[in-house]
Amino acid sequence: IVLRPSRVHNSEENTMRALTLKDILNGTFSYKTFFPNWISGQEYLHQSADNNIVLYNIETGQSYTILSNRTMKSVNASNYGLSPDRQFVYLESDYSKLWRYSYTATYYIYDLSNGEFVRGNELPRPIQYLCWSPVGSKLAYVYQNNIYLKQRPGDPPFQITFNGRENKIFNGIPDWVYEEEMLATKYALWWSPNGKFLAYAEFNDTDIPVIAYSYYGDEQYPRTINIPYPKAGAKNPVVRIFIIDTTYPAYVGPQEVPVPAMIASSDYYFSWLTWVTDERVCLQWLKRVQNVSVLSICDFREDWQTWDCPKTQEHIEESRTGWAGGFFVSTPVFSYDAISYYKIFSDKDGYKHIHYIKDTVENAIQITSGKWEAINIFRVTQDSLFYSSNEFEEYPGRRNIYRISIGSYPPSKKCVTCHLRKERCQYYTASFSDYAKYYALVCYGPGIPISTLHDGRTDQEIKILEENKELENALKNIQLPKEEIKKLEVDEITLWYKMILPPQFDRSKKYPLLIQVYGGPCSQSVRSVFAVNWISYLASKEGMVIALVDGRGTAFQGDKLLYAVYRKLGVYEVEDQITAVRKFIEMGFIDEKRIAIWGWSYGGYVSSLALASGTGLFKCGIAVAPVSSWEYYASVYTERFMGLPTKDDNLEHYKNSTVMARAEYFRNVDYLLIHGTADDNVHFQNSAQIAKALVNAQVDFQAMWYSDQNHGLSGLSTNHLYTHMTHFLKQCFSLSD
């Protein structure tokens, strides 16, 4: 299936040009999306091109500026947040990135009623997290690992926690491992729907081993970065959840929420918190051996002033074939009765589907079914449930939005997006206003992305929010590569692949092949999305064929494929890449003497193992920031898929699956190893150990480090990285510069 045909015709060939590396590095062909910042059923805020904050009312068609760019500029604000009572706006400046989601910033409160900044009892700086209550204008914020509460922006703060300590106790914000591997947020506090209560997590990292690495900076001596980071099998953070009454916090104090007995009996994680009403909260817990999850619904008992989590409101989710959930355990979406909920988990056939839970999980009513997967529940209203899936036309790499009418019986299903812009749009997400009165659809491809606004009742398109016209015009004279998404059937395994072909691709010719791999558990690389990136350039300008293959362990095609890698990381992911390459060679247009593989992070691990597989298929390859041994990576992630590195569990496979164990096999390939020295995620240690093993085996290889760069290798390092990798590949494929 050709998803993005090149617009090359002989008549216009002269005016067309190939992509250049400079195009990619400059972001010349980047696209925009439009996500409304909903503030009611029919109103949203948006930051205009000239940086004014504008309020749009869909029903009246009116818009007005609530905050001028002058005010924004006066404090160098890069972000904002309107209080729900619309009296105040917080302005965020001095953004300073920490880890993937976390950052600190300076916050100013602007009073919209008098057009002045709030003076007196100003917020301290830098703040780690700040948010408005869902109703009114209470503020909760985290400063120096402690949580504070303001009843009004001009009021003095009430300090909720006092034990916060850098790298030791984290209140209201996650530690490194919870941020990266469990919550995927910068915050760990949650307001109840009307702002009566504030729930928060406390993470105690006192006993966690610390990863230390040098940050070279510009000083005479490098400084040492210390992060409590539990690697596989190490001591984990100890988590506790508290809830405080924000109306009179000084009186009752924080109430600790009890952990379900079956969870508390051994090491465990807290995985998420969902408020149902002001007096009902749902907590999700997970055993350290991550195949058992418990969802616990707790009620506030006014007479006791306590949170009661009865055993009858504990719902157990267990996997017997792998780990609980997909990448994370799914979160519940509660219905209007405030006790039943919708949740995605595996059905009896091993496909993730929406289930309705009224009393027990055993009696769950399956809402969706089929040999495809429900991926996200966006919104449940009184009569509709909106979700995304990859059902349409049986392409796992697509996302369409569906509506199920839950108000009628039997429920009817409608695909909202399948036929809207069928060629252009096959991969959607959505953003809903209150009560799903309106929604925005954001289409990511395969054509040029487009964002549109829709009526939540009729699904009618109201207007285009962003259609990337400038990008469309800029691409008119570019020879884009062709892309196709197809599948291979091998030994009862379906391997979906995306192939990116040079613009003048000719099946009778031979092309160098580059495999781009990620391959991590529950990931998906073969997606019907638009991208003009480095591999687009390699196909367009350098005439390479690039292929991405989703093998065993990848997501959204059922548990058989997903859980195939359970406790065996580094085996089937690699096998499936190799199998796919052999199939590509059989297609007849691949030069089998010029095949390379590259990947980043988990992909760096897979590419390294593929190069060291001893097949002789690969001439060269690149590993960027690879994992080299699962003993070096984070406990939460690693143990989910690998169990524990202990003799009585899975130590043997931990040892067998290292890159270092295969050092000898790198002798007959050209290997480029790349890593940032300040990688907080996949530590430089991983590449240092590969390099040591290769040196000890007297195997030649190439390497590049990026001083003081993290896992993302951003900024000028990005340019250097892609330039360096381009040279390496061109040399490997004997392409002239």
Epitope: F158, V252, Q255
Partner: antibody, heavy 117, light 108 residues
Framework: EVQLLESGGGLVQPGGSLRLSCAAS????????MSWVRQAPGKGLEWVSA????????YYADSVKGRFTISRDNSKNTLYLQMNSLRAEDTAVYYC??????????WGQGTLVTVSS | EIVLTQSPGTLSLSPGERATLSCRAS???????LAWYQQKPGQAPRLLIN???RRATGIPDRFSGSGSGTDFTLTISRLEPEDFAVYYC?????????FGQGTKVEIK
């Protein structure tokens, strides 16, 4: 009816130790934060320490930090204050009170601690 | 720590009169975190005005609390004989919670 009953006070030499108890009844003890407040003879009130319902968080006034330990046994509906390294300035009537940092709506009758050689 | 200064130190009034007791904080507190107590000789303190200017359970409506920021007032609209006692204000916004030094309301 809510009742708080302190015990364990008495005469102790400087450097000595005492353990105060506060037996609670008439409410769900484990749900509520509790505090100790003291009053030196003829003087005003001074907050000493607080503990949340589960016992998981405790706080102390600087004047007693490192010497006093607040704890509770929810199965016995009892609050404790372990006082070590006592000084003359710790002489006071010690009250247990229901509450966290404020709004102490129920108080015990108090127990007198005298630190003297 | 927040210092609470109560004034006057002693207030001499007759039954039936209005009593106005003042409590000034060294930094902003707000009424959400200020409480008032009554203490009679040989007895434990009794909560009068809970945080948020709410009268505690069983407290007659002649007692009322007001104020914001740093200045707070306890008003007893008509003094009854049983109201002659020492009154303390207390803040709970910042650790450590602190009490004022007290105002003694005595019979004139």
């Amino acid at each position: 009816e809510v009742q708080l009953l302190e015990s364990g006070g008495g005469l102790v030499q400087p450097g000595g130790s005492l353990r105060l108890s506060c037996a609670a009844s008439g409410f769900t003890f484990s749900s509520y934060a509790m505090s100790w407040v003291r009053q030196a003879p003829g003087k005003g009130l001074e907050w000493v320490s607080a503990i949340i319902g589960s016992g998981g968080i405790t706080y102390y006034a600087d004047s007693v930090k490192g010497r006093f330990t607040i704890s509770r046994d929810n199965s016995k509906n009892t609050l404790y204050l372990q006082m070590n390294s006592l000084r003359a300035e710790d002489t006071a009537v010690y009250y247990c009170a229901k509450g966290w940092f404020g709004g102490f709506n129920y108080w015990g009758q108090g127990t007198l601690v005298t630190v003297s050689s | 720590e927040i210092v609470l200064t109560q004034s006057p130190g002693t207030l001499s009034l007759s039954p039936g009169e209005r009593a106005t007791l003042s409590c000034r904080a060294s930094q902003s507190v707000t009424s959400s975190y200020l409480a008032w107590y009554q203490q009679k000789p040989g007895q434990a303190p009794r909560l009068l005005i809970n945080v948020g200017s709410r009268r505690a359970t069983g407290i007659p409506d002649r007692f009322s609390g007001s104020g914001s920021g740093t200045d707070f007032t306890l008003t007893i609209s008509r003094l009854e004989p049983e109201d002659f006692a020492v009154y303390y204000c207390q803040q709970g916004i910042m650790l450590p919670p602190t009490f004022g030094q007290g105002t003694k309301v005595e019979i004139k």
